[in-house]
């Protein structure tokens, strides 16, 4: 059975969050997709969305967020560049399908951004801040002012979470900790 999970990314200020959300190609290829932040007890807030209809491999930039929808592969890529401490929070990808409620994609992302310069001597992480390139053509898309009460949740208490951490040999650049936590709605 498919489990809605939460993955934790711990990054430093200035680094880039680079994630992907997968969707059912046949159903949602050209649907408009959005990146939302979920604050405890509040409605999810849309921060950026693709065009409508969504264009293939066409980067859309809203501030420090870049969305790229790979239609052919059923993947939405989300990049948040030059991360700030205040970007910390719970995020999710959704697909707009009016008049129905937005369709939530797996997985949710728990982003924790901490102070501290990345890539300093002695650091075992490489910063992507000097590496990231802004796509040559970007479009600012208008997002529907629509949120779904159904997706207002709080993460499960730690005591009930079945936490499985990455294999010990994994060393992800720019990611100090990724923890997968099932979310029970």
């Amino acid at each position: 059975a498919t489990k809605l999970t939460e993955e934790k990314y711990e990054l430093k200020e200035g680094q880039t969050l680079d994630v992907k959300c997968d969707y059912t190609l046949e159903k949602f290829a050209s649907s408009q997709k959005a990146w939302q932040i979920i604050r405890d007890g509040e409605m999810p807030k849309t921060l950026a969305c693709t065009e409508r209809p969504s264009k293939n491999s066409h980067p859309v930039q809203v501030g420090r967020i870049i969305l790229e929808d790979y239609h052919d592969h059923g993947l939405l890529r989300v990049r948040m560049v030059n991360l700030q401490v205040e970007d910390s929070g719970l995020y999710q990808c959704v697909i707009y399908q009016p008049p129905k409620e937005p369709h939530m994609l797996f997985d949710r992302i728990r982003l924790v951004v901490t102070k501290g310069f990345s890539g300093t001597p002695g650091s075992n992480e490489n910063s992507t801040q000097n590496v990231y390139k802004i796509p040559p053509t970007t479009t600012k898309a208008l997002c529907p002012l629509y949120t779904s009460p159904r997706t207002v949740t709080q993460a499960p208490p730690k005591s009930t979470a079945d936490v499985s951490t990455p294999d010990s040999e994994i060393n992800l650049t720019n990611v100090t900790d990724i923890i997968r936590v099932p979310v029970f709605n």
Epitope: K3, T5, D22, T24, E68, Y70, R77, F106, I170
Partner: antibody, heavy 123, light 107 residues
Framework: QVQLVQSGAEVKKPGASVKVSCKAS????????INWVRQATGQGLEWMGW????????GSVKKFRDRVTMTRDTSISTAYMELSSLRSEDTAVYYC????????????????WGQGTLVTVSS | DIQMTQSPSSLSASVGDRVTITCQAS??????LNWYQQKPGKAPKLLIY???NLETGVPSRFSGSGSGTDFTFTISSLQPEDFATYYC?????????FGQGTRLEIK
């Protein structure tokens, strides 16, 4: 430790289909995407596509889109890749591969490889 | 699709030599580049990810550098077990593509 064990070699006639299995162990199967990469004899590596074992969603390159189906059985931690309408140029070793990071990470680094399955297409 | 061009396609060297392989992308791929080693009859093995990060357990004689379109893979002092074929692979966007490979042979 992480292990991906693939099914044995297959010999198929042109026009037939082949289904290669990939049994995962040593990690949480639904937490990491499985990708498929093939290599014709004496040739380079060719990425075919990916599958998220949790959602069941998958995607493949245009070249294979109409002929490839990627599925999984989470109860036995096994991924499958079926290629139909086989032709002689599909003769290759097919590898299932696990990425370095969780399914949500945009990090296509192929860290753990199966031993490969040789598929021979011959009349 | 992004094309990855490796050079040379084959290379003869001796144990102890310093060996360099280059990989050129048809457009800027930032640091989204990996290097693999493959021995005959075996599956490829990830050596370097994100252009310069050494995979856990890989000897430090292997290194990678570069960003944008030009990348370099170096073996500082060739060992007998290093004779193999090496591939670069980008993942700046989808689809993912590999270089055609560089075959490293004993001189």
């Amino acid at each position: 430790q992480v292990q991906l064990v693939q099914s044995g070699a297959e010999v198929k006639k042109p026009g037939a289909s082949v289904k290669v299995s990939c049994k995962a162990s040593g990690y949480t199967f639904t937490s990491y995407d499985i990708n498929w990469v093939r290599q014709a004899t004496g040739q380079g590596l060719e990425w075919m596509g990916w599958m998220n074992p949790n959602s069941g969603n998958s995607g493949s390159v245009k070249k294979f889109r109409d002929r490839v189906t990627m599925t999984r059985d989470t109860s036995i931690s096994t991924a499958y890749m079926e290629l139909s309408s086989l032709r002689s140029e599909d003769t290759a070793v097919y590898y299932c591969v696990r990425l370095i990071g969780y399914s949500s990470a945009y990090k296509w680094s192929f860290q753990h490889w199966g031993q490969g399955t040789l598929v021979t297409v011959s009349s | 699709d992004i094309q990855m061009t490796q050079s040379p396609s084959s290379l003869s060297a001796s144990v102890g030599d310093r060996v360099t392989i280059t990989c050129q992308a048809s457009r800027d791929i930032s640091k989204y580049l990996n290097w693999y080693q493959q021995k005959p009859g075996k599956a490829p093995k990830l050596l370097i990810y994100d252009a310069s990060n050494l995979e856990t357990g890989v000897p430090s004689r292997f290194s990678g550098s570069g960003s944008g379109t030009d990348f370099t893979f170096t073996i500082s002092s060739l060992q007998p077990e290093d004779f193999a074929t090496y591939y670069c692979q980008h993942y700046d966007n989808i689809p993912i593509t590999f270089g055609q490979g560089t075959r490293l042979e004993i001189k």
